[in-house]
């Protein structure tokens, strides 16, 4: 069991467009057709102004107009909902498709892609209907931009909602060697296929990917719970032959100073095919990017039933060490190391300011906003420790 590991299925709260938890000041756009179709009118199910955000310029052939929502804190965004223009039922404008871009720091923007590399999302077929899009993979973002598309010169307008939850882990990025391919009766691709950072010279840095998406792999790493994906999809893996040092080194960057209790690493142990739990883990800590690593590394040797071939979460105690950066070495105990998820149990150190600049206002872990309720494909559950919005049978 992954303690502290978030469950993506429960991370589907309305983040505050419809219920105005997100203030007007956090909604902006590249342009607006008029003040009555300004960005602030882009709230799902709202009939304010002329009933939606409508850009001033055409979105065909250039797709440069966008609606931006600033969530103020990092959130995992699992779902988005879109509508066209209301205008007292007279609105005819909507967007048949759109793209998403997102940022964690307001400087570097990434385009959202699905698991097969598709960027374009099917949107609305009429102005009034709400269409939900499940984001697989979800995105960790503070800022989200919607770029409406059209296949001809036409007016498009948008109303939106975002669904998800606060990114409580605080993990901004991890750096790791590029995952490798294992050759069995078929090729098993153990790359991090949703990584949104940079890849240079066999190293991935500055991003997040499958090791932080909430999806844990199966006992048989060739299998995935995701449909129509390649063998090995849920795991990132490295071969002992490629690492003369005898370990894989990863670095983790967090949003602010944290006291780390433990790291949870979900590992495969199908040793009949070469996958083994790490023999040990060694982690170092530092408070800033240019600072020295502090004190002695924390070392943890793995015991337990290493012969059991089932995949499992390995807990690495971190002793409450305070840091914003961790560097961990995972020692090979067999031909391959295969990880599907890494999460951390930590507490923010009081008075530590966020790394992204500025101070964020407090945001609840479970945002209070209800979802849109006028269409049958959305399911409601009571408030409390349950999610309040889930997409049910929404089109892909």
């Amino acid at each position: 069991d992954m303690k502290g590991h978030f469950d993506p299925a429960k991370c589907r709260y309305a983040l505050g467009m419809q219920d105005r938890t997100i203030p007007d000041s956090d909604i902006s756009a590249s342009s607006s057709w008029s003040d009555s179709t300004a960005a602030r009118h882009s709230r799902l199910e709202s009939s304010d102004g002329d009933g939606a955000w409508c850009p001033a310029g055409s979105v065909f052939p250039k797709e440069e107009e966008y609606l931006q929502v600033d969530l103020q804190r990092l959130h995992l965004v699992a779902l988005v909902g879109t509508q066209g223009r209301h205008a007292g039922g007279l609105g005819k404008e909507f967007s048949r498709s759109y793209r998403l871009r997102y940022s964690r720091d307001g400087r570097r923007w990434m385009g959202w892609k699905d698991r097969w590399g598709q960027e374009v999302i099917s949107g609305n077929e009429d102005p009034e209907g709400v269409v939900l899009k499940d984001l697989g993979p979800p995105m960790v973002a503070r800022l989200v931009r919607f770029y409406p598309r059209a296949d001809r010169v036409m007016s498009v307008c948008l109303r939106v909602e975002l669904y998800g939850c606060l990114w409580r882990d605080g993990l901004l990025s991890y750096t790791a060697p590029v995952g490798q391919t294992m050759y069995l009766s078929e090729a098993v691709y153990l790359n991090d296929s949703t990584y949104d950072g940079h890849t240079v010279g066999g190293l991935q840095y500055g991003g997040l990917g499958q090791l932080a998406d909430g999806v844990v792999g199966l006992d048989d790493f060739r299998k995935s719970q995701e449909l129509r994906v390649w063998p090995g999809y849920d795991y990132v893996g490295w071969s002992n032959h490629s690492f003369s040092s005898g370990y894989v080194e990863m670095e983790f960057e967090f949003d602010r100073l944290r006291a780390f209790q433990a790291m949870q690493v979900h590992c495969n142990n199908m040793h009949t095919l070469g996958a083994r739990l790490p023999g040990g883990v060694e982690c170092r800590f530092r408070r800033g990017p240019a600072m020295a690593w502090e004190g002695e590394p924390m070392r943890h040797n793995l015991g337990g039933n290493l012969g059991d071939p089932r995949a499992r979460a390995v807990s690495v105690p971190l002793g409450g060490r305070v840091a914003r950066f961790l560097q961990c070495r995972f020692l090979f105990a067999g031909p391959w190391l295969l990880f599907s998820e890494i999460s951390f149990i930590s507490d923010v150190v009081n008075n530590s300011s966020p790394a992204l600049g500025g101070t964020f206002p407090p945001a609840p872990w479970w945002p209070p906003g209800p979802p849109p309720t006028n269409f049958s494909s959305l399911e409601l559950e009571p408030r409390g420790q349950q999610p309040v919005a889930k997409a049910e049978g929404s089109p892909t």
Epitope: D7, A9, A78, L132, K133, D134, G136, S185, E186, A187, Y189, V215, L218, R222, K223, S224, Q225, E226, L227, R228, V229, W230, P231, Y233, K390, A391, E392, G393, S394, P395, T396
Partner: antibody, heavy 117, light 111 residues
Framework: DVHLQESGPDLVKPSQSLSLTCTVT?????????WHWIRQFPGNKLEWMGY???????KYNSSLKSRISITRDTSKNQFFLQLKSVTTDDTGTYYC??????????WGQGTLVTVSA | DIVLTQSPTSLAVSLGQRATMSCRAS??????????MHWYQQKPGQPPKLLIY???NLESGIPARFSGSGSRADFTLSINPVEPDDVATYYC?????????FGSGTKLEIK
């Protein structure tokens, strides 16, 4: 292991809607996999009807698209099939099943539905 | 839609011998260097049971007497040696493209 069990009426009149429930035990339908409906006609031909993904999105066989709807109730860990305007050609055994990237690993026992006046 | 044609429609094999059946797809079912073709066994009154996934991988709990091979559009299921319990209908199924489709089946009997 995942266990699936179909339930619903065994007799439906032509032009009415067929509604079936699949109850899943020992696994949450929001945690992973696609949750499918497959039917087998009296001559043993198998037809995939559609699925609801663990995330909530759906895909349907285009031959049924205007008549089929698959939904779910996550609180009860159930998913549902609704097939509108049935004819005698819709008679068969209806299975719910689950799949990842490796075929339909788990199946219900199936329920025989007869469409007859 | 991808059409899967299975041959032969029925097959009679002596106990202890090898049974081989074929599945041909109307187009390739390969992607990412792997074949999204699966094989099932169905006995009367029971649901189909997964035997082989992605062309050649033996599903857990299935005896090693069953094996699968092939790529792109041509696939084979072999049973060696055949045992009495193998009497059933065998179906191939592709999951590379919507809609997922099944073959019409090969019925295995003991000679």
């Amino acid at each position: 292991d995942v266990h699936l069990q179909e339930s619903g009426p065994d007799l439906v009149k032509p032009s009415q809607s067929l509604s079936l429930t699949c109850t899943v035990t020992d696994y949450s339908i929001t945690s992973g996999y696609g949750w499918h409906w497959i039917r087998q006609f009296p001559g043993n031909k198998l037809e995939w009807m559609g699925y609801i993904h663990y995330g909530g999105s759906t895909k349907y066989n285009s031959s049924l698209k205007s008549r089929i709807s698959i939904t779910r109730d996550t609180s009860k860990n159930q998913f549902f099939l609704q097939l509108k305007s049935v004819t005698t050609d819709d008679t068969g055994t209806y299975y719910c099943a689950t799949s990842g990237n490796y075929g339909f690993a788990y199946w219900g026992q199936g329920t025989l539905v007869t469409v007859s006046a | 839609d991808i059409v899967l044609t299975q041959s032969p429609t029925s097959l009679a094999v002596s106990l202890g011998q090898r049974a081989t059946m074929s599945c041909r797809a109307s187009e390739s079912v390969d992607d990412y260097g792997t074949s999204f073709m699966h094989w099932y066994q169905q006995k009367p009154g029971q649901p189909p049971k997964l035997l082989i996934y992605r062309a050649s991988n033996l599903e857990s709990g299935i005896p090693a007497r069953f094996s699968g091979s092939g790529s792109r559009a041509d696939f084979t299921l072999s049973i060696n040696p055949v045992e009495p319990d193998d009497v059933a209908t065998y179906y191939c199924q592709q999951s590379n493209e919507d809609p997922f489709t099944f073959g019409s089946g090969t019925k295995l009997e003991i000679k």
